[in-house]
Amino acid sequence: VPRWRQQWSGPGTTKRFPETVLARCVKYTEIHPEMRHVDCQSVWDAFKGAFISKHPCNITEEDYQPLMKLGTQTVPCNKILLWSRIKDLAHQFTQVQRDMFTLEDTLLGYLADDLTWCGEFNTSKINYQSCPDWRKDCSNNPVSVFWKTVSRRFAEAACDVVHVMLNGSRSKIFDKNSTFGSVEVHNLQPEKVQTLEAWVIHGGREDSRDLCQDPTIKELESIISKRNIQFSCKNIYRPDKFLQCVKNPEDSSCTSEI
C-alpha cells in the first residue's frame, strides 16, 4: 500500500539534489583557496540535517546553524553587491568585476542557487514530488528559511558603500516583499554601512527616464535614511554597454553615461 504523501503547491526537490550540493561544494572549495579546509561531506551532512525528517513548514533559522558554521566565509565587506529581481546581470557583473561579491559568489549561496529542496516529517526521505510554496503553503519552508538566513548574515557583514542592483523594468523597482526589501535592507548595520548605492537597470533601449525618481526608489531612500544610512542612486541606461565597460574601462565610449 503506497504511503500517503503531503502534496504541496510548489515544485519538488531538484533532481539529484544531494549530488549537486556535493559537486558544487567540491568545485567551489577547489576554486577558492581560502575555503580549501572545508569538508564537503560535513557540509552535505549539515545541509541534510537542516530539513530531513522535519515538517517542511516548520523549519527555523536554528536548523541551519550547523551549516552556517561550516560555511563561514569572510568576503571583503566593502565589496558586496546585493540584487533584487535581476540576478543574471548581477552575476555577470561579479564574474567580470572579480573583487565584488553577490551572495551566490559565497559558498553557501553557490551551493543552493536555483535549487529547491524539502523533506517529510518523520521520514529520512527527500520529497522530489512537491515542496511548500511560500505564498500558497507556508513561509517557513526549507528554501525560504535558508535564503532568509544567508541573506541576513550577508547583509550584516556589509560595510562602507554597499551596492544593490534593481530591475527598472518591473512595476515595483524596489519591492518591500523581496528578499532585499524584507531582509537585507533591515540588516545592514548603520554603524558599519555608510551608503547604499542603488543601480537601477533599464530594460528598454530608448528608455531615458530617470528611474531614480520612481516612487518605490523614494520609498527605499526613506527606509534607508531612517536607518541612518546615506542613499544614492544611478541609472544604468544600457546594461550591455555597462558590462562591456566593466570589462574594458579604457574603451573611449565608456566615458559617456551608461
Partner: antibody, heavy 117, light 107 residues
C-alpha cells in the same frame, strides 16, 4: 559503506594505452571527486588528476596533461583512467580515491600496470 | 608545484615509544595538509586532515600539528600495527602533492 573496486592487473607494451576502472558503491557517486594517484615500485605517491562526474569536470596534473584521460559512467558508478603512450616509467600501482575535499578518505585496492616489451 | 619534504626517510623505534615525523612544504600550505599510513601491498589510509583533525576511526595516539610550512605527525606510543610508511600531502595548491614518505620500522 563506501567501497572502491578496481579492475585487475595489466601488462602493456611501450607506446600502447591502458584503461583502469574504479567501481564505487555508496551514495551520490556523481557528487564526489574521483582522483587517480599512482605509485611506482618502491616509490612515493603521485596525484594524476580527478573528475567530478556530475559536472563532467576534470583536472589533470601538468605532468600527465595530454596523456591521461579521466572519465566516469554515472549509470554504473564507475570512473576510468586511461593513460596513453605508455613507457617503462609508467609501471606502477594505480589507485582511485574518492574525496569530498582535498584529502582522500576512501581508496581503491590498486591496479598494477606493468609496461614491458 | 609545491614540494613536500619528509624527514627522516627511515625512523627506527621500539614498540611503546613515541615517534615524531616531520613534513616541510616549499611554500605555505596554511593548514591544508593530510597524513596517510601505508602498509606493504595495501592502499594508503587517511589518518589526519586539516593538519590536526583525526579521520574517522583513527586512534587518539595519532596526532598532527603545524601550519604554514612545518608539520609534525606524532604517534604517542607505537603499537605493532603502526609500523608502516607515512606520507604527508598538501591540498592548498594544484597539483596536490605528496612527500616521499617516512618508513617507521621496528628498532
Amino acid at each position: 559503506q563506501v567501497q572502491l573496486v578496481q579492475s585487475g592487473a595489466e601488462v602493456k607494451k611501450p607506446g600502447s594505452s591502458v584503461k583502469v576502472s574504479c567501481k564505487a558503491s555508496g551514495d551520490f557517486f556523481s557528487g564526489y571527486a574521483i582522483n587517480w594517484v599512482r605509485q611506482a615500485p618502491g616509490q612515493g605517491l603521485e596525484w594524476m588528476g580527478r573528475i567530478i562526474p556530475l559536472l563532467g569536470d576534470t583536472y589533470y596534473a601538468q605532468k600527465f596533461q595530454g596523456r591521461v584521460t579521466i572519465t566516469a559512467d554515472e549509470s554504473t558508478s564507475t570512473a576510468y583512467m586511461e593513460l596513453s603512450s605508455l613507457r617503462s616509467e609508467d609501471t606502477a600501482v594505480y589507485y582511485c580515491a574518492r574525496s569530498a575535499a582535498g584529502w582522500f578518505a576512501y581508496w581503491g585496492q590498486g591496479t598494477l600496470v606493468t609496461v614491458s616489451s | 608545484e609545491i614540494v613536500m619534504t619528509q624527514s627522516p626517510a627511515t625512523l627506527s623505534v621500539s614498540p611503546g615509544e613515541r615517534a615524531t615525523l616531520s613534513c616541510r612544504a616549499s611554500q605555505s600550505v596554511s593548514s591544508n595538509l593530510a597524513w596517510y599510513q601505508q602498509k606493504p601491498g595495501q592502499a594508503p589510509r587517511l589518518l589526519i586532515y586539516g593538519a590536526s583533525t583525526r579521520a574517522t576511526g583513527i586512534p587518539a595516539r595519532f596526532s598532527g600539528s603545524g601550519s604554514g610550512t612545518e608539520f609534525t605527525l606524532t604517534i604517542s606510543s607505537l603499537q605493532s600495527e603502526d609500523f608502516a610508511v607515512y606520507y604527508c600531502q598538501q591540498y592548498n595548491n594544484w597539483p596536490w602533492t605528496f612527500g616521499q614518505g617516512t618508513k617507521v620500522e621496528i628498532k
